[in-house]
């Protein structure tokens, strides 16, 4: 490429989290080049003997790819020319967590940036009224979490109240023996109130809200990844 080694290009990464068993994205962008054949992308993982992924001369070069990533990686080939070096990682594993390096060579120079990739399991909770219970009870369920999260209940009417004495949370290991189903039950619920079930670990925070009135039940839930500079 005629690179002297004195020139450096800007490479930018974004810390992110992967949901085990699903596909993930390791984000990386760089100053684009006009010729695809002049661009080399290398993804490396700290402490791993082989490469995570290599893309050069317009195609994947996987002869030195590490066994743990075999068949699980892809770049967005049509977006490389515009400076997107992001890596798609299929079927994220718990052991994919760690520090990654996105290393770029173009005709303008070289550059690299590291990113922290966390892995775990996180899912949206659903809050329902438990009609089988003897008293007014809410049941909050989320199918997949790892590591084990904390569960906290809150109420719009009784802001700041501690519901730990009137709630019960259990964690049930799923069939793959890693993730767990989260079930939390809140007792002594009053109507005309909005209750929130908040599930959080070091990777994600999810909230399920339920508004119970005489005439209707309204639900809402959302999930936020933590420590991701999105």
């Amino acid at each position: 490429f005629g690179i002297s080694g004195r020139h450096s290009i800007t490479v930018t990464t974004v810390a992110s989290a992967g949901n085990i068993g699903e596909d993930g994205i390791l984000s990386c962008t760089f100053e684009p080049d006009i010729k695809l054949s002049d661009i080399v992308i290398q993804w490396l993982k700290e402490g791993v003997l082989g490469l995570v992924h290599e893309f050069k001369e317009g195609k994947d070069e996987l002869s030195e790819q590490d066994e743990m990533f075999r068949g699980r990686t892809a770049v967005f080939a049509d977006q490389v020319i515009v400076g997107n070096a992001s890596l798609r990682l299929k079927n994220v594993q718990l052991t994919d967590a760690g520090t990654y390096k996105c290393y770029i060579i173009t005709s303008k120079g070289k550059g690299n940036a590291n990113l922290e990739y966390k892995t775990g399991a996180f899912s949206m909770p659903e809050v329902n009224v438990d009609y089988n219970a003897s008293s007014e009870t809410l049941r909050c369920e989320a199918p997949r979490w790892f590591p084990q999260p904390t569960v906290v209940w809150a109420s719009q009417v009784d802001q700041g109240a501690n519901f730990s004495e009137v709630s019960n949370t259990s964690f049930e290991l799923n069939s793959e023996n890693v993730t767990m189903k989260v079930v939390s039950v809140l007792y002594n619920v009053t109507i005309n109130n909005t209750y929130s079930c908040m599930i959080e670990n070091d990777i994600a925070k999810a909230t399920g809200d339920i508004k119970v009135t005489e005439s209707e039940i309204k639900r809402r839930s959302h999930l936020q990844l933590l420590n991701s500079k999105a």
Partner: antibody, heavy 122, light 107 residues
Amino acid sequence: EVQLLESGGGLVQPGGSLRLSCAASGFTFSSYAMSWVRQAPGKGLEWVSAISGGGGSTYYADSVKGRFTISRDNSKNTLYLQMNSLRAEDTAVYYCARDIQWYGESTLFDYWGQGTLVTVSS
Amino acid sequence: DIQLTQSPSTLSASVGDRVTITCRASQSIRSWLAWFQQKPGKAPKLLIYKASSLEGGVPSRFSGSGSGTEFTLTISSLQPDDFATYYCQQYNSYSRTFGQGTKVEIK
């Protein structure tokens, strides 16, 4: 100061098992791949096995595949080699060595332990 | 698997001599080659990595060259402390292999 200290060697009968340990200190253990290398008496060096920093990848020489298992406990900064179905030809001094941090960039096998002797004999 | 062949197996030399050891790989390993020095009863010591990069603290009389399948370790002026056995090692991707060793002895 980087230090690697092997233990667990000794005399074992053919077909027996042994577990070697390597206690590491002086560096961020989880950031580095680690390897085991052995040297039979009066012979050359033979790479045995390696494991990635997070433990997600393991690698073996053909001569030990299926018999030896490498593992690590990053919370204890310790590397292990479980050796099963031992043979006379496994008799050697076993060294642990710090392997790479980054593919293609860093030095490797820059620090070694003092070695532990494994003797397989009836 | 990638094989490494070192030559010569034994080398007799005198203090002040220029010594060259060759290492050939059975297939291309680019520049993924290291050189080690070992003395009796001691663990090996890294001298050269990435074919030609000198490890910190290693005297400049040691140098490495080559790429692909042919590599050399050169000691420009042999010192008394250099009499030892030298090994090349390839680390192409996730395999590692050592050469059979070259013993440098006093002539």
